[in-house]
């Protein structure tokens, strides 16, 4: 009896449901009373689920498995595994017995995406060329173990003096911490890439370190040189500080935040009082910190429309000002891949592969490549559509003539978050249907 299962491992995200496909070809006159079906763990032979004597015997595996009873008579012996855990990873064998018997094993590969890395710098103040700094890159709750890569602003790998540690929790999910020690040049960007080898998911973060410059103006007003990056819907702090002289009191302070280009008032503090928000009631100062010279502005529930430059004006006796840029971002969803036509595909057929990723900002960069990593640039059409909130949906369409077999990958890159979202489809030489039917 021929039992068919997928050759490639089934990849399932932790917490989702997975279908382990298994099928047989029933002969004419076949009835379920003749069927004995057993799913078991290949290595330990532990029973997972069974069907015998015309009845589903139920789950023997933490009550998280189910068959497809309506499809059994057509030869579909697939198993549904619910709420996948790391511990489920491994090989499952599907035994089918009618008169004869056959079996085949299918592999389950479990995965969980890593979070966007957090970057910390020590020391993080008064940095100058020649200083040795420690940069820590931390990414959380992924599976399997990550690969971590460091590089400089020119993309040159940084391999010396890197220590990477991975820690697993009770659920088997890993935290990864990678530490780079480096001597600062005149300026430099240091990037950390955390790769999930199963999901082909890359999570990036970087830190740019520039030598200190003295701001102009009689009152020295300091703001971050790099744009402040804020996710849509979160709160952002636009940092601004000045150095109060001895005896300074808030009665002397005039503080104005405004939009740099239009000069629209955003928030002000004058005559010893917070005059409140003039910007959709979504801004606030840090009143307890003003006397220490902290003039930072809190912007709540960031929107795409908030993106741009904000100027911080500080006047005591003299005055000074500086502008800080707000860069708004929203991550793109994992791309959805569709294939047309999607049935009975053969080498030489022309197919249209559509890669769709949703609700990101700013506009994405889309790249296609084949299974060997060679870019596919011909016959690609990419469209981006913005909604009322300014978030983009991206749809990229590739038309390609099928070879004997091939993998076609789509990478949707958020240029601000340095977030890459991948999708791929593999088309084999045999006549096939996409997505594969259970």
């Amino acid at each position: 009896l021929e039992v068919q299962v997928p050759e490639d491992p089934v990849v399932a995200l932790v917490g989702t449901d997975a279908t382990l496909c298994c099928s047989f070809s029933p002969e004419p006159g076949f009835s379920l009373a003749q069927l004995n079906l057993i799913w078991q763990l290949t290595d330990t032979k532990q029973l997972v689920h069974s069907f015998a004597e015309g009845q589903d015997q139920g789950s023997a595996y933490a009550n998280r498995t189910a068959l497809f009873p309506d499809l059994l008579a057509q030869g579909n012996a697939s198993l549904r595994l619910q709420r996948v855990r790391v511990a489920d990873e491994g090989s499952f064998t599907c035994f089918v017995s009618i008169r004869d018997f056959g079996s085949a094993a299918v592999s389950l590969q479990v995965a969980a995406p890593y979070s966007k890395p957090s970057m910390t710098l020590e020391p993080n103040k008064d940095l100058r060329p020649g200083d040795t700094v420690t940069i820590t890159c931390s990414s959380y709750q992924g599976y399997p173990e990550a690969e971590v890569f460091w590089q400089d602003g020119q993309g040159v790998p940084l391999t010396g003096n890197v220590t990477t540690s991975q820690m697993a929790n009770e659920q088997g999910l890993f935290d990864v911490h990678s530490i780079l020690r480096v001597v600062l040049g005149a300026n430099g960007t240091y990037s950390c890439l955390v790769r999930n080898p199963v999901l082909q998911q890359d999570a990036h973060s970087s830190v740019t370190i520039t030598p200190q410059r003295s701001p102009t103006g009689a009152v020295e007003v300091q703001v971050p040189e790099d744009p402040v990056v804020a996710l849509v819907g979160t709160d952002a702090t636009l940092r601004c500080s000045f150095s109060p002289e001895p005896g300074f009191s808030l009665a002397q302070l005039n503080l104005i935040w405004q939009l740099t280009d239009t000069k629209q008032l955003v928030h002000s503090f004058t005559e010893g009082r917070d005059q409140g928000s003039a910007y959709a009631n979504r801004t606030a100062l840090f009143p307890d910190l003003l006397a220490q010279g902290n003039a930072s502005l809190r912007l709540q529930r960031v929107r795409v429309a908030d993106e741009g430059s904000f100027t911080c004006f500080v006047s005591i006796r003299d005055f000074g000002s500086a502008a800080v840029s707000l860069q708004v971002a929203a991550p793109y969803s994992k791309p959805s891949m569709t294939l047309e036509p999607n049935k009975d595909l053969r080498p030489g057929d022309t197919v249209t592969i559509t890669c769709s990723s949703y609700r990101g900002y700013p506009e994405a960069e889309v790249f296609w490549q084949d299974g060997q990593g060679v870019p596919l640039t011909g016959n690609v059409t990419t469209s981006q559509m913005a909604n009322e909130q300014g978030l983009f949906d991206v749809h990229s369409v590739l038309r390609v003539v099928l070879g004997a077999n091939g993998t076609y990958s789509c990478l949707v890159r958020n240029p601000v978050l340095q977030q890459d979202a991948h999708g791929s489809v593999t088309i084999t030489g045999q006549p096939m249907t996409f997505p594969p039917e259970a």
Epitope: S118, S138, Y140, Q141
Partner: nanobody, 117 residues
Framework: EVQLVESGGGEVQPGGSLRLSCAAS????????MSWFRQAPGKQREPVAT???????NYAESVKGRFTISRDNAKNTVYLQMNSLRAEDTAVYYC???????????WGQGTLVTVKP
């Protein structure tokens, strides 16, 4: 900006116990992954344990079964209970906070733990 202040370090004999505390400023403490790292003399800093904003915990193999990380979101504090201490646990212990969504990270100044007979 989040400020982290560690306390509870000190000298203890092998087999003894210590409880470290890390108090954080800021109103969104529950959104942070809170970690303890340590740095022994002449060695690189290494992670010891993490308490995630979702409630799960991770431990380095070398401390599993001996150390327990916990957090009190109401007090903006994370703890490290260290039992069955060994000489090789001697290090400066640092608290680290990583925001779960905007990928900003912060370090504390560290507290020294010395294990010696």
């Amino acid at each position: 900006e989040v400020q982290l202040v560690e306390s509870g370090g000190g000298e203890v004999q092998p087999g003894g116990s210590l409880r470290l505390s890390c108090a954080a400023s800021g109103s969104t403490f529950s959104m942070y992954h809170m970690s303890w790292f340590r740095q022994a003399p002449g060695k690189q800093r290494e992670p010891v344990a993490t308490s995630h904003h979702g409630g799960t915990t991770n431990y380095a193999e070398s401390v599993k079964g001996r150390f327990t990380i916990s957090r009190d979101n109401a007090k903006n504090t994370v703890y490290l209970q260290m039992n069955s201490l060994r000489a090789e646990d001697t290090a400066v212990y640092y608290c680290k906070a990583d925001h779960g969504y905007n990928a900003r990270g912060y370090w504390g100044q560290g507290t020294l733990v010395t294990v010696k007979p």
